[in-house]
């Protein structure tokens, strides 16, 4: 009679993560008497995957009834496959022995490959805001995919970016892989509404790539432009001076009026107007009683935007052009700002 052979007909099996892998094995004879066991890997450190009679293997089921006297099918199913299950599986016949059973013959092995989807890409931008014309870096990370081949692209508002570097780790063989990419983006004043997109394509995604996004509104700071103007006289001895704060982002802004270097009023931007490009405009005004001044008045609009050093614009008010009212010592009427929307 021919000696028993252990046949594993499949050299390789490819399974998607979460699915069930079927590993086929048959023996050509019932002799010698002894169990079949499944291992992953070879050598003394091999991992026991299934032992018919002993041990706990909750993810493994047999394809046929191994207790049947004439059974020669030792195929198994492994449920809920993960990338960590990848490897070569051996179906091994043992001969009954004392004290321990003795390995008799092994199958040629079946390589289990696991296809695992990448995680949703996570895009993160710089910790601090940057202003237009500056270059900022964005990173994109995705993990847990297999096989290693993967494609990553960067877009800004639908336009593909070319200035980026990508690494897939680890370099050698692994059960699963991670991708890390860094893209450089030049900011413009129009980027408040812009988006940076990281797109990952992998064989497991069937042509439907995963995307991660970052809004440049979280990254950009557009500093304001200031314009101080003198309005027509509203009443005798009174001049209305406005400070128009234009095209700034984000909204966090504090404005201080100074008369000849002395603080007159401080206010925080609240009712702002949003421009089409996402930036904001705001206007503050100051009513100056010129009769309180003997000399010309230097009015300064000082703006602190988003915690940055203050920027200012000044306007010289000529007092000589207006009649002076005796006995008045009020320099300005702080009646609050008229937060009208100026375009």
């Amino acid at each position: 009679e021919e000696e028993l052979q252990v046949i594993q007909p499949d050299k390789s099996v490819l399974v998607a993560a979460g699915e069930t892998a079927t590993l086929r094995c048959t023996a050509t004879s019932l002799i010698p008497v002894g169990p079949i066991q499944w291992f992953r890997g070879a050598g003394p450190g091999r991992e026991l995957i299934y032992n018919q009679k002993e041990g706990h293997f909750p993810r493994v089921t047999t394809v046929s009834d191994l207790t049947k006297r004439n059974n020669m099918d030792f195929s198994i199913r492994i449920g809920n496959i993960t990338p960590a299950d990848a490897g070569t599986y051996y179906c091994v016949k043992f001969r009954k022995g004392s004290p321990d059973d003795v390995e008799f013959k092994s199958g040629a092995g079946t390589e289990l490959s696991v296809r695992a989807k990448p995680s949703a890409p996570v895009v993160s931008g710089p910790a601090a805001r940057a202003t237009p014309q500056h270059t900022v870096s964005f990173t994109c990370e995705s993990h847990g995919f297999s096989p290693r081949d993967i494609t990553l692209k960067w877009f800004k508002n639908g336009n593909e970016l070319s200035d980026f570097q990508t690494n897939v780790d680890p370099v050698g063989e692994s059960v699963s892989y991670s991708i890390h990419s860094t893209a450089k983006v030049v900011l413009t004043r129009e980027d408040v509404h812009s988006q940076v997109i990281c797109e990952v394509a992998h064989v497991t995604l069937q042509g439907d790539p995963l995307r991660g996004t970052a809004n440049l509104s979280e990254t950009i700071r557009v500093p304001p432009t200031l314009e101080v103007t003198q309005q027509p006289v509203r009443a005798e001895n009174q001049v209305n001076v406005t400070c128009q704060v234009r095209k700034f982002y984000p909204q966090r802004l504090q404005l201080t009026w100074l008369e000849n270097g002395n603080v007159s009023r401080t206010e925080t931007a609240s009712t702002v107007t949003e421009n089409k490009d996402g930036t904001y405009n705001w206007m503050s005004w100051l009513l100056v009683n010129v009769s309180a001044h003997r000399d010309d008045v230097k009015l300064t609009c000082q703006v602190e935007h988003d915690g940055q050093p203050a920027v200012s614009k000044s306007h010289d008010l000529k007092v000589s052009a207006h009649p002076k009212e005796q006995g008045s010592n009020t320099a300005a009427e702080n009646t609050g700002s008229n937060e009208r929307n100026i375009y």
């Epitope: 450190g45 091999r46 026991l48 018919q52 009679k53 002993e54 041990g55 191994l66 207790t67 321990d100």
Partner: antibody, heavy 114, light 108 residues
Framework: EVQLVQSGAEVKKPGATVKISCKVS????????IHWVQQAPGKGLEWMGR????????KHNPKFHDRVTITADTSTDTAYMELSSLRSEDTAVYYC???????WGQGTTVTVSS | EIVLTQSPATLSLSPGERATLSCRAS???????LYWYQQKPGQAPRLLIY???NLASGIPARFSGSGSGTDFTLTISSLEPEDFAVYYC?????????FGGGTKVEIK
């Protein structure tokens, strides 16, 4: 539901023999080994031996080898453990367990006393 | 025979504390064959960890197992009142199957 139900407590004299049964249900009796484990009062667990009910093949702990006999009756899905030449140090709880070590009997107390 | 030595024999801790139990084998044991059990007075042992690091069904995630070769560890991250019991390691890598002497985790 997998169950292993053992026979009741026994009191034996030194030199006697005790035979404990372990009736299984909820799975195919021939699918797995049945192990026997001893636990003396206040002591740890000691593996005594096992049987493959499919073919009657047994393995024993050399400590018990000459005194322990493990058998199985596939017609009643029952395993047996017989311990002979009892001595006081055999006073213990005896457990049967399935080959996956998940399912255990409730234990049988054997007291050996003159 | 593979001798399994557990230490410490007794561990006195308070609820909420971390418990680290050691099991050392006299010769190398492949991880697949190293199991841990919990036993409470008057009860049969209950399987906690199989294949050195896999949690058995219904066992809380505060239990974890690690190790390979001759050194294995059972960790209980934060002790609950119901965790005070005796813990055994067990090998079925070779005959005779053996158990460690046990570690009793008691309330301090």
């Amino acid at each position: 539901e997998v169950q292993l139900v053992q026979s009741g407590a026994e009191v034996k004299k030194p030199g006697a023999t005790v035979k404990i049964s372990c009736k299984v249900s909820g799975f195919n009796f021939e699918d797995t080994y049945i192990h026997w484990v001893q636990q003396a009062p206040g002591k740890g667990l000691e593996w005594m031996g096992r049987i493959d009910p499919a073919d009657g093949d047994t393995k024993h702990n050399p400590k018990f080898h000459d005194r322990v006999t493990i058998t199985a009756d596939t017609s009643t899905d029952t395993a047996y453990m017989e311990l002979s030449s009892l001595r006081s140090e055999d006073t213990a709880v005896y457990y049967c367990a399935t080959g996956n070590y998940v399912n255990w009997g409730q234990g049988t107390t054997v007291t050996v006393s003159s | 025979e593979i001798v399994l030595t557990q230490s410490p024999a007794t561990l006195s801790l308070s609820p909420g504390e971390r418990a680290t139990l050691s099991c050392r084998a006299s010769s190398s044991v492949t991880s697949s064959y190293l199991y841990w059990y919990q036993q409470k007075p008057g009860q049969a042992p209950r399987l906690l960890i199989y294949s050195a690091s896999n949690l058995a069904s219904g066992i809380p995630a505060r239990f974890s197992g690690s190790g390979s070769g001759t050194d294995f560890t059972l960790t209980i991250s934060s002790l609950e009142p119901e965790d005070f019991a005796v813990y055994y390691c067990h090998q079925w890598y070779s005959y005779p199957r053996t158990f460690g002497g046990g570690t009793k985790v008691e309330i301090k």
